[in-house]
């Protein structure tokens, strides 16, 4: 008799999750000599057992307390690139400008970048068919809550200038409801955090507006000050320029506004 | 900005204990959880043990529980570690560092303890 299984309204687990999360644990170590020690079986044994046999939307920060712990890392604070809808550049970013990172530069963001996953209580399955959707079935399912986690604690570390990369091609420009509004923003500590500075990517090759004057900056500026830190705006007019100069400095055509 | 300065570290005979102490400044002492992390020689960075802001809640890696204490004393923003059963194998550069991880900066110099007979 088939068992009955939760239809739940968000994709699956990614298919060859398991295999996947040991693979880039296994890569990430061999690129990073400084993570070499990590026994990377157990970084798999630990991710898995924050969800397996539990309830997709039961889940709690403490479950992936066995994870954290194995992804401890030193990242230079005063290095840290926070993005929010614009993830692809604010990577080809930090693959230029190697001493900057990002969350997804770290092991525990890079093991579950793009990843979805879910088990079912009471069974050592993963759950291949369906997961737990944020909205239409509950926000403490496992991917939330491990983004949720490793964001704030991201966030946390931060120290001087923090920089955040924001995409200006769309309606609202900061989203109080994204990652970076809803858990990043509230977790940088106004004792080691000087500035934000956001960074604003504009989408047309002819927008020449200020987007810094955007009222969703606007309202990004005034969360910010009233966490006593100061708040700076760019545009990056031109984003092509902008990683071409990150990569040739010297390059006479980037002393003029990118 | 966050300073901090280890101190208590040395040469200690297997099953010996040492306490380590760190002191903080630059910022609200009691309002940080605070951590001991700990770089072996061609080893990567290691989470020792993380005490909250009140000092209430404590954590410790699996390899340290039941012979390491940490504690902390607001008063005199000061952290410290106290290590007791020690063995070969936590021999290591101990760093004491603001928050509770994974990410970690580590501001000082750190103190080294080596345990060898």
């Known amino acids: 008799v088939p068992r009955w299984r939760q239809q739940w309204s968000g994709p699956g687990t990614t298919k060859r999750f398991p295999e996947t999360v040991l693979a880039r644990c296994v890569k990430y170590t061999e690129i990073h000599p400084e993570m070499r020690h990590v026994d990377c079986q157990s970084v798999w044994d630990a991710f898995k057992g924050a969800f397996i046999s539990k309830h997709p939307c039961n889940i709690t920060e403490e479950d992936y307390q066995p994870l954290m712990k194995l992804g401890t890392q030193t990242v230079p604070c005063n290095k840290i690139l926070l993005w929010s809808r614009i993830k692809d550049l604010a990577h080809q970013f930090t693959q230029v400008q190697r001493d900057m990172f990002t969350l997804e530069d770290t092991l525990l963001g890079y093991l579950a970048d793009d990843l979805t996953w879910c088990g079912e209580f009471n069974t050592s399955k993963i759950n291949y068919q369906s997961c737990p959707d944020w909205r239409k079935d509950c926000s403490n399912n496992p991917v939330s809550v491990f983004w949720k986690t490793v964001s704030r604690r991201f966030a946390e570390a931060a120290c001087d200038v923090v920089h955040v990369m924001l995409n200006g091609s769309r309606s609202k420009i900061f989203d109080k409801n994204s990652t970076f509004g809803s858990v990043e923003v509230h977790n940088l500590q106004p004792e080691k955090v000087q500035t934000l500075e956001a960074w604003v990517i504009h989408g047309g090759r002819e927008d020449s507006r200020d987007l810094c004057q955007d009222p969703t900056i606007k309202e990004l500026e005034s969360i910010i000050s009233k966490r006593n830190i100061q708040f700076s705006c760019k545009n990056i007019y031109r984003p092509d320029k902008f990683l071409q100069c990150v990569k040739n400095p010297e390059d006479s055509s980037c002393t003029s506004e990118i | 900005e966050v300073q901090v300065l280890e101190s208590g570290g040395g040469l200690v005979q297997p099953g010996g204990s040492l306490r380590l102490s760190c002191e903080a400044s630059g910022f609200t002492f009691s309002n940080f959880a605070m951590s001991w992390v700990r770089l072996a020689p061609g080893k990567g960075l290691e989470w020792v043990s993380t005490?909250?802001?009140?000092?209430?809640?404590?954590s410790y890696a699996d390899s340290v529980k039941g012979r390491f204490t940490i504690s902390r004393d607001n008063s005199k923003n000061t952290l410290y570690l106290q290590m007791n059963s020690l063995r070969a194998e936590d021999t290591a550069v101990y760093y004491c560092?603001?928050?509770?991880?994974?990410?970690?900066?580590?501001r000082g110099q750190g103190t080294l303890v080596t345990v060898s007979s």
């Open positions: 560092a603001d928050g509770r991880g994974p990410f970690f900066d580590y």
């Open positions: 005490i909250s802001g009140s000092g209430g809640s404590t």
